[in-house]
């Protein structure tokens, strides 16, 4: 059973992940460059279901494509280089989902823009955090 300390740690990690995703979204929304409009032409794959921490596997699998798109922003809208930002997110995701169980991600049929993708995972984080508090 999860202890209060492990729950608190999970909550903090989710809050950190949430802030990172929100920072990316804000950076994109503030970005004045032809690359922003081009960013919207990139497809992201969405989870069929995202209600548990194990479903973060679906986010992990899309981090490389996310990094590629963020590289278009030439980093000036982000405090960190996309590579470092995605690396930080990857560390948190791995800790949150755990590496013991292998979960095969199931994707929804419809793909999403980067904005829709980030909003989906922001909502996921907020939802899980709310169940922990």
């Amino acid at each position: 059973a999860p202890t209060s300390s492990s729950t608190k740690k999970t909550q903090l990690q989710l809050e950190h992940l949430l802030l990172d995703l929100q920072m990316i979204l804000n950076g994109i929304n503030n970005y004045k460059n032809p690359k922003l409009t081009r960013m919207l032409t990139f497809k992201f794959y969405m989870p069929k279901k995202a209600t548990e921490l194990k479903h973060l596997q679906c986010l992990e699998e899309e981090l490389k494509p996310l990094e590629e798109v963020l590289n278009l922003a030439q980093s000036k809208n982000f405090h960190l280089r996309p590579r470092d930002l995605i690396s930080n997110i990857n560390v948190i995701v791995l800790e949150l989902k755990g590496s013991e169980t292998t979960f095969m991600c199931e994707y929804a049929d419809e793909t999403a823009t980067i904005v829709e993708f980030l909003n989906r995972w922001i909502t996921f984080c907020q939802s899980i955090i709310s169940t922990l508090t």
Epitope: N33, P34, T37, R38, L40, T41, F42, K43, V69, T111
Partner: antibody, heavy 116, light 108 residues
Framework: EVQLVQSGAEVKKPGESLKISCKGS????????IGWVRQMPGKGLEWMGI????????RYSPSFQGQVTISADKSINTAYLQWSSLKASDTAIYYC?????????WGQGTLVTVSS | SYELTQPPSVSVSPGQTARITCSGD??????AYWYQQKSGQAPVLVIY???KRPSGIPERFSGSSSGTMATLTISGAQVEDEADYYC???????????FGGGTKLTVL
């Protein structure tokens, strides 16, 4: 209602210069990219380049770099496409379009004919 | 340079389903957009982000994408759908915008 209204048809001789226009209305002209697309007689659509009227940041297709100049005057919500020395092969319809990652609204097109 | 490949022409009888394909190596990760251009007119967006239909576009127009192929489907094609159709996307980097060569749809 979003509208892009282009200048009228032009008939020119090779070597002459030309500047055609595209006036936007019904939206914040300065915060959307405007693209230019060429369609030669009986042919398909070709992307030429884009401009951000807010600060005139411009990007060109490699095929059109150095061949044309794209500019804008945000004070009158107008984008321009110009040639310093026209060639017969520039004969085409030129469209401007609002770029939101794709072209959602288009002008009616400007027919440019270059003939001696 | 990146290319999008379309068939030059597609013919259907009125009421039949017309399918126009567009292939490109980057399409697994890039959205496809579709434009209709009737003779002497400016292009009109009929499908964006693979499958979304702008307001005012009839329901018979739909889009799908799988792997390197995007498809525009016109279910129950009508005579007024006769036009040139162009797919549009960007290369892997997102830097270069590309139109397909266009497909002439004949409804006879």
């Amino acid at each position: 209602e979003v509208q892009l209204v282009q200048s009228g048809a032009e008939v020119k001789k090779p070597g002459e210069s030309l500047k055609i226009s595209c006036k936007g209305s019904g939206y914040n002209f300065t915060t959307y990219w405007i693209g230019w697309v060429r369609q030669m007689p009986g042919k398909g659509l070709e992307w030429m380049g884009i401009i951000y009227p807010g600060d005139s940041d411009t990007r060109y297709s490699p095929s059109f770099q150095g061949q044309v100049t794209i500019s804008a005057d945000k004070s009158i919500n107008t984008a321009y496409l110009q040639w310093s020395s026209l060639k017969a092969s520039d004969t085409a319809i030129y469209y401007c379009a609002r770029d939101t990652g794709y072209f959602d609204y288009w002008g009616q097109g400007t027919l440019v004919t270059v003939s001696s | 340079s990146y290319e999008l490949t379309q068939p030059p022409s597609v013919s259907v009888s009125p009421g039949q389903t017309a399918r126009i394909t567009c292939s490109g190596d980057a399409l697994p990760r890039k959205f496809a957009y579709w434009y209709q251009q009737k003779s002497g007119q400016a292009p009109v967006l009929v499908i964006y982000e693979d499958r979304k239909r702008p307001s005012g576009i009839p329901e018979r127009f739909s889009g799908s994408s799988s792997g390197t192929m995007a498809t525009l489907t016109i279910s129950g094609a009508q005579v007024e759908d006769e036009a040139d159709y162009y797919c549009y996307s960007t290369d892997r980097s997102g830097d270069h915008v590309v139109f397909g060569g266009g497909t002439k749809l004949t409804v006879l």
